[in-house]
Amino acid sequence: QPDAINAPVTCCYNFTNRKISVQRLASYRRITSSKCPKEAVIFKTIVAKEICADPKQKWVQDSMDHLDKQTQTPKT
């Protein structure tokens, strides 16, 4: 039986201080758990590296917008 209650929570404790080019980004997910000390975004790069970023930063918001738009474009 799935043990969702005790599922591990991923948190970000530090944010990247470098702006990442959107061409290097493949996806993102939001950390919204109240168990985490910071609201955060985890970007996954095209080489599958995960990077914590601050959702308050403009470049982070713009990158999320860019990735969102890609989800409505059919992959050919």
Partner: nanobody
Framework: EVQLVESGGGLVQAGGSLRLSCAAS????????MGWFRQAPEKEREFVAL????????FYSNSVKGRFTISRDNAKNTVTLQMNSLEPEDTAVYYC????????????????WGQGTQVTVSS
């Protein structure tokens, strides 16, 4: 946690206009894609419109395109839906939603929802 409160619903005659507002509180408003959805009696909840975090991109369902306009004010933590040329088919409960996860118009990518506001269009 993001709290969303809708207002502006009501009863209007066909051809009339309404302006729905959604006030957000809690976490960083500008870091969420915002959307409006609606649910008519006995029907599934359906996507109406969305606006990107920057406000630079909007997207509408075919049924409201050209009649509804979505906008946002990140300084005031609000998103509005201007609804013109209303039709009886627009009658529904309208929900404001904040999209945290990667996606577009899919309801499953919106983590936070308001309680909804009733819009009734009479013929």
């Amino acid at each position: 946690e993001v709290q969303l409160v809708e207002s502006g619903g009501g009863l209007v005659q066909a051809g009339g206009s309404l302006r729905l507002s959604c006030a957000a509180s809690g976490r960083t408003f500008s870091s969420y894609r915002m959307g409006w959805f609606r649910q008519a009696p006995e029907k599934e909840r359906e996507f109406v419109a969305l606006i990107s975090r920057s406000g630079g991109t909007t997207f509408y369902s075919n049924s409201v395109k050209g009649r509804f306009t979505i906008s946002r004010d990140n300084a005031k933590n609000t998103v509005t839906l201007q609804m013109n040329s209303l039709e009886p088919e627009d009658t529904a409960v309208y929900y404001c939603a904040a999209g945290a996860q990667m996606g577009w118009a899919e309801a499953s990518t919106y983590d936070y929802w308001g309680q909804g506001t009733q819009v009734t269009v009479s013929s």
